[in-house]
């Protein structure tokens, strides 16, 4: 029952003498396992015996007998699904039909496989895409209908006999569907590959040549052009003739149109391979190329730069940069269309030739105001000298120059005067637009560049002004030299360094902080009385009577200034002590009597001591000694002693008389 046996394998396998053949094969016997397998070469059915005749390459039977060929032929299958075979080595006479005779318990089957063994290794086959175009990546495929595990091979790509640099990807297939070895090469052909010979070479594992396939590449490309010019250097003078020729070195497919371009723009009515330019003008200078098109696209030649030579045209001057700032650098460029380029230049400043300046550029590293003006130039080449153009104006900008602060007042200036100053300058570019003054004050600026100081202060020493355009220039400060009466007059004690004691030598100094003018006179006064005209007031031996309020005056030509009143204090021991009695020196007993110790002292008496007629000190220490009630026994002479920080003083005796009251007398 044929439906029970299903086989899958390549229809035909290819190999060559000495190689091997690997036959991938699968089968399905539905009625049970395989019991017997015979591999025939060119089997023929014998009707008489009802068996197949032919060379038995391999036999697998129940009794296990196998022919000697089995070393070369191997059945790599199994009893139910795999029928893979290997013949190694394979020989030329193995060509033909292989018959796989399969038997199970109840069924038999003969499966036929074609084997094509050539005498020599057959060539691979190169497959090309239908069209190859320059710079477009293509894949070249080299296919060989052979692959066998026991016989490794390799496929190598050659271009004009040289191995190709691009990496090829080789793949093999040993399946029931197909057996092959394939190499794929990706590359981007250039126009120069057109007509070149590409070879796929079959080699054995050692790199030995076995066979090859060859193709000549047909690379479609835009026309490749060469441009030739007469004269060859493409340098001519106005009025000369020029011939340009366009040569097509390669075009695939054939070219269809020709055109010429100048500076990228197509020239009208120029559609031949030769471009004739008669009596050229300088306007015809430029970059020329020819363009030839085919079905792939346009091809362009390299550009030829046609130079039509002429004498320099009137020149113009370019200034980098105007206006220029004083001290900066400036470059002047002489621009003149000329061919060849000018070799010599003449420069003019305000119409006068600038000596030693013959270059296209003039560089002034440090610009000064006098560099301002008109600059012009003349260019010269081998064909002649150009004309001087209109020139260019250099504006040199600088801060105001020679700025001075000027006092407008008659001198000298006195404190309290109104002072007017002006800010003057010599030159400025651009014009002065504002002024600044130092130091700042609440001053009037009645007009630009004028400063009015009302009621000028004694301490307004210097004033400076700045004239400003884009920059400010400061004048040197000017001294106002304000004159004023002496200031800060005060009395200062020079000696003694401590307090003044009666009898000390004393010096007082009349001080002042400043005076303008410096020449001064001094006056000392006490209580409106002039004491002296020196800066110092001296006392050889001071007495308490010298104490009081002192003032000094300092005057100069502007005026006089008095000090604050200064109090001179003289310290002395208690003096002029006396005991006064109240209500009198005669008091009736029983009444009250008060004795007071009066004194003159500086500082005042701080401690009093009372003595009786026996010089006996009494237990009283205040200024007043109060006796109440007074007794007759209190009668007698009393004296007191006063003490301060300077010393002691004593009073003379004062007698107190206490007389009896009428009552006492009445009792007696």
């Amino acid at each position: 029952d044929s439906s029970k046996w299903v086989f899958e394998h390549p229809e035909t396998l290819y190999a060559w003498e000495g190689a091997c053949v690997w036959i991938p094969c699968t089968y399905r016997a539905l009625d049970g396992d395989l019991e017997s397998f015979i591999l025939f070469h060119n089997p023929e059915y014998n009707k008489n015996t009802s068996k197949f005749d032919g060379t038995r390459l391999y036999e697998s039977t129940k009794d296990g007998k196998v022919p000697s060929e089995q070393k070369r032929v191997q059945f790599l299958g199994d009893k139910n699904k795999n029928c893979t075979l290997s013949i190694h080595p394979v020989h030329l006479n193995d060509s033909g039909q292989l018959g796989l005779r399969m038997e199970s318990k109840t069924e038999k089957w003969m499966e036929r496989i074609h084997l094509n063994v050539s005498e020599r290794p057959f060539p691979p086959h190169i497959q090309l895409p239908p069209e190859i175009q320059e710079s477009q990546e293509v894949t070249l495929t080299c296919l060989l209908n052979f692959s066998c595990y026991g016989y490794p091979i390799q496929l190598q790509w050659l271009l004009e006999g040289v191995p190709m640099r691009q990496a090829a990807v080789t793949s093999t297939s040993l399946t029931i569907k197909s057996v092959f070895t394939r190499s794929e090469l990706k590359f981007s052909p250039q126009w120069s590959h057109h007509g070149k010979i590409v070879t796929c070479q079959l080699q054995d594992a050692d790199g030995k040549f076995l066979s090859n396939d060859t193709v000549q590449l047909n690379v479609k490309h835009t026309p490749k052009l060469e441009i030739k010019v007469t004269p060859s250097d493409a340098i001519v003078r106005e009025g000369d003739s020029v011939t340009m020729t366009c040569e097509v070195s390669s075009s695939n497919p054939e070219y269809t149109t020709v055109s010429w371009l100048k500076d990228g723009t197509s020239l009208k009515k120029q559609n031949t391979f030769t471009l004739n330019l008669r009596e050229v003008t300088k306007d015809q200078s430029g970059k020329y190329c020819c363009q030839v098109s085919n079905d792939v696209g346009p091809g362009r030649s390299e550009e030829v730069f046609l130079q039509v030579q002429y004498a320099p045209e009137p020149s113009t001057v370019q200034i980098l940069h105007s206006p220029a700032v004083e001290g900066s650098q400036v470059e002047f460029l002489c621009m003149s269309l000329a061919n060849p380029l000018p070799t010599n230049y003449t420069w003019y400043h305000n119409g006068k030739e600038m000596q030693g300046r013959t270059e296209e550029k003039v560089h002034i590293p440090k610009i000064l105001p006098w560099h301002a003006g008109t600059y012009s130039c003349v260019a010269e080449n081998i064909l002649g000298t150009g004309q001087r153009g209109p020139g260019a104006e250099l504006d040199v900008q600088y801060p105001p120059k020679k700025v001075t602060t000027v006092i407008q007042n008659p001198m000298p200036i006195r404190e309290g005067d109104t002072v007017t100053l002006s800010c003057n300058y010599n030159s400025s570019n651009p014009s002065v637009t504002r002024y600044e003054w130092k130091p700042h004050g609440a001053w009037e600026e009645p007009s630009l560049g004028v400063l009015k100081i009302q009621n000028v202060g004694w301490d307004n020493t210097t004033i400076a002004c700045a004239a400003c355009n884009s920059w400010c220039s400061w004048a040197s400060p000017v001294a106002l030299n304000v004159q004023y009466a002496p200031r800060d007059v005060r009395v200062r004690k020079i000696k003694p360094l401590s307090e003044i004691h009666s009898g000390n030598s004393v010096s007082l100094q009349c001080d002042f902080s400043s005076s303008h003018p410096k020449e001064v006179q001094f006056f000392w006064e006490k209580n409106g009385r002039l004491l002296g005209k020196e800066s110092q007031l001296n006392f050889d031996s001071i007495s308490p009577e010298d104490a009081g309020s002192y003032s000094c005056w300092v005057n100069n030509s502007i005026g006089q200034t008095a000090s604050k009143a200064w109090t001179l204090e003289v310290l002395y021991a208690p003096r002029r002590l006396r005991v006064s009695m109240s209500p009198g020196d005669q008091v009736m007993e029983g009444k009250s009597a008060t004795l007071t110790c009066e004194s003159d002292a500086n500082p005042p008496v701080s401690h009093y001591t009372w003595f009786d007629w026996n010089n006996q000190s009494l237990p009283y220490h205040s200024q007043k000694l109060r006796l109440e009630p007074v007794k007759v026994q209190h009668s007698g002479a009393y004296w007191c002693q006063g003490t301060n920080s300077v010393g002691k003083g004593r009073s003379p005796l004062s007698t107190l008389t206490v007389y009896y009251s009428p009552e006492t007398i009445g009792r007696r």
């Epitope: 040289v162 007509g195 070149k196 047909n218 060469e226």
Partner: antibody, heavy 116, light 112 residues
């Protein structure tokens, strides 16, 4: 070995056409381009064009492109060059040739005489 | 097309003499992929097809006597016969095959 064998000499009248054959052997015919070159008496060799037998692609010298047709029969490994509107200046020896990487193979030449 | 200009047109030398002939190309025939110059030299005798002497500008074809040598690169090429023999009388052509094919006008060699 590689051989290119050309058809015999031809005598033609002006205005007529001629078809010269070139049979290739000893190599795979479709692997290489086949060129045609002619040489007029006492003149330089002049390239006419080529055919790529693999895909019948042709390329011609601009001087001939309106009058020449190159064809190939791969089954017979033979290339043909047909020249029409013959004139006396077409009198020349016509060669087929092919290049290999390191050599050139030439046919023996076919003499064409154009005479009234 | 690439134009090949040969010089001189003809020359006559005595047997045994050294001879050089030139071929100038209007464009370079150097192929960058393999750094070979695609220029060949042929010898052609009357009634015969051209015979290849030199390919790749300087490689001698097998069987060609070593008195023949080629040199040059890019656009300027020379064929030298170191010692001219009587059988060398022929016309010598240069041939570029980088792009299409073009041939030089030939140099005719004669023996005095």
């Amino acid at each position: 070995q590689v051989q290119l064998v050309q058809s015999g000499a031809e005598v033609k009248k002006p205005g007529a056409s001629v078809k010269v054959s070139c049979k290739a052997s000893g190599y795979t015919f479709t692997s290489y381009w086949l060129h045609w070159v002619r040489q007029a008496p006492g003149q330089r060799l002049e390239w006419i064009g080529y055919i790529n037998p693999r895909n019948d692609y042709t390329e011609y010298n601009q001087n001939f492109k309106d009058r020449v047709t190159i064809t190939a029969d791969t089954s017979a490994s033979t290339a043909y060059m047909e020249l029409s509107s013959l004139r006396s200046e077409d009198t020349a020896v016509y060669y087929c040739a092919r290049r290999d990487i390191t050599t050139f193979y030439w046919g023996q030449g076919t003499t064409l005489t154009v005479s009234s | 097309d690439i134009v090949l200009t040969q010089s001189p047109d003809s020359l006559a030398v005595s047997a045994g003499e050294r001879v050089t002939m030139n071929c100038k190309s209007s464009q370079s025939v150097l192929y960058s992929a393999n750094h070979k110059n695609y220029l060949a030299w042929y010898q052609q005798k009357p009634g015969q097809p051209p015979k290849l002497l030199i390919y790749w500008a300087s490689t001698r074809e097998s069987g060609v006597p070593d008195r023949f040598s080629g040199s040059g690169s890019g656009t300027d090429f020379t064929l030298t016969i170191s010692s001219v023999q009587a059988e060398d009388v022929a016309i010598y052509y240069c041939h570029q095959y980088l792009s299409s094919w073009t041939f030089g006008g030939g140099t005719k060699l004669e023996i005095k």
